[in-house]
């Protein structure tokens, strides 16, 4: 891949990014796993979904997530005076009507039931990483990525471009 980018000041512009079009440009059903090949699983508990990061038993079926890709335009610089460039944003839905959301106050990743149009908290900038990995940066909190903490998904602040290769924010997407 192109190698991972940095974040920092530039990503303040993500707040002002605009999703081009209401419908996704494409969709992809995939299993989501960590850099260390642990699976991201979703369990219905007390009428709400919990998200886990765990080792699956042999032949245990992986949970799938529907990634919906959106083309997004972002301002050319921090002042936002003009447009330059395109980004790919995604929403992630493990089951009908439920989407991953960034809860920036709690630094957590949650599954919320909601209707379209989806709130900004459900959108993540998709980064094409080295070693066939991706990372997910919050649209609502630039420089903050979905990561793994204590066998759960959490929001992790990445404070410099050198730290973007940190394994706990790297994920693998697979059709199997």
């Amino acid at each position: 891949a192109f190698g991972i980018s940095g974040v920092q000041k530039y990503t303040r512009a993500l707040h002002d990014s605009s999703i081009t079009g209401i419908s996704p440009i494409t969709e992809y059903l995939a299993s989501l796993s960590t850099y260390n090949d642990q699976s991201i699983t979703f369990a219905l508990e007390d009428e709400s979904y919990e998200i886990y990061v765990e080792d699956l038993k042999k032949d245990e079926k992986k949970d799938k997530v529907l990634l919906s890709y959106y083309e997004s335009q972002h301002p050319s610089n921090e002042s936002g005076d003009g447009v330059d460039g395109k980004m790919l944003m995604v929403t992630l839905s493990p089951t009908k009507d439920f989407w991953l959301h960034a809860n920036n106050k709690e630094h957590s990743v949650e599954l919320h039931k909601c209707e379209k149009p989806l709130p900004d908290q459900a959108f993540f900038v998709l980064h094409n990483m080295h070693s066939n990995c991706v990372s997910f940066e919050c649209k609502t909190d630039p420089g903050v990525f979905i990561g793994v903490k204590d066998n759960h998904l959490a929001l992790i602040k990445v404070d410099s471009s050198e730290n973007l290769c940190t394994e706990n924010i790297l994920f693998k997407l697979s059709e199997t």
Epitope: A1, F2, Q8, L88, L126, C165
Partner: antibody, heavy 119, light 111 residues
């Protein structure tokens, strides 16, 4: 305005060395993966090398591995290509390119600098 | 290495006509459900300019007459009605894997 300006090209003898520079402006340099792409006179485009925003990863086309080194100085907003053991077939216009935010494609290109390897 | 083959090598058309350019990959350029195939335009003495990314999405400031389609290994760039400024060389490029490769180019010339 996003701008990439290459410099350092010129005439060099086979076996010689040259260092190309690319000065970036109008964006937060360290947030983007950068690459070099070359074009021999009258020919098509060839990707040469890429470096990640945080300098963690580099990749090269096989034909330049061990001879060329891509690097960057994020404090100076500058990309470099150190070219050693130059050959006639390295003669080309060398373009500095910036990936889009997220690193999916080459989005911004400089005007290029011509490197001529000849005795 | 993924080899990209463009056809035709040269396309001779008049302004107002429709141009259809083809790019075929030696293997699929799909990754993460995306077709990582991009199109660039290059005019003499100028650097390439991004037209289309991920097979079908226009770059910033690219006119609507340019459109891309295709998936897997077969891709098409269409210019619905050629303007005088569209006569140039067009390259496809894959960003699925290193080494990133380009097609040999299609020259669209005035008939």
């Amino acid at each position: 305005e996003v701008q990439l300006v290459e410099s350092g090209g010129g005439l060099v003898q086979p076996g010689g060395s040259l260092r190309l520079s690319c000065a970036a402006s109008g964006f937060t340099f360290s947030s983007f993966s950068m690459s070099w792409v070359r074009q021999a006179p009258g020919k098509g485009l060839e990707w040469v090398a890429t470096i990640s925003g945080g300098k963690t990863f580099t990749d090269y086309v096989d034909s330049v591995k061990g001879r060329f080194t891509i690097s960057r100085d994020n404090s100076k907003n500058t990309l470099y290509l150190q070219m050693n053991s130059l050959r006639a077939e390295d003669t080309a216009v060398y373009y500095c390119t910036r990936a889009n935010y997220g690193n999916w494609f080459f989005e911004v290109w400089g005007q290029g600098t011509l490197v001529t390897v000849s005795s | 290495e993924i080899v990209l083959t463009q056809s035709p090598a040269t396309l001779s058309l008049s302004p107002g006509e429709r141009a259809t350019l083809s790019c075929r990959a030696s293997e699929s350029v799909a990754k993460y459900g995306l077709s990582l195939l991009n199109w660039f335009q290059q005019k003499p003495g100028q650097p390439p300019r991004l037209l289309i990314f991920a097979a079908s999405n226009r770059g910033s400031g690219v006119p609507a007459r340019f459109s891309g389609s295709g998936s897997g290994t077969d891709f098409t760039l269409t210019i619905s009605s050629l303007e005088p400024e569209d006569f140039a060389v067009y390259y496809c490029q894959q960003s699925k894997e290193v080494p990133f490769t380009f097609g040999q180019g299609t020259k669209v010339e005035i008939k």
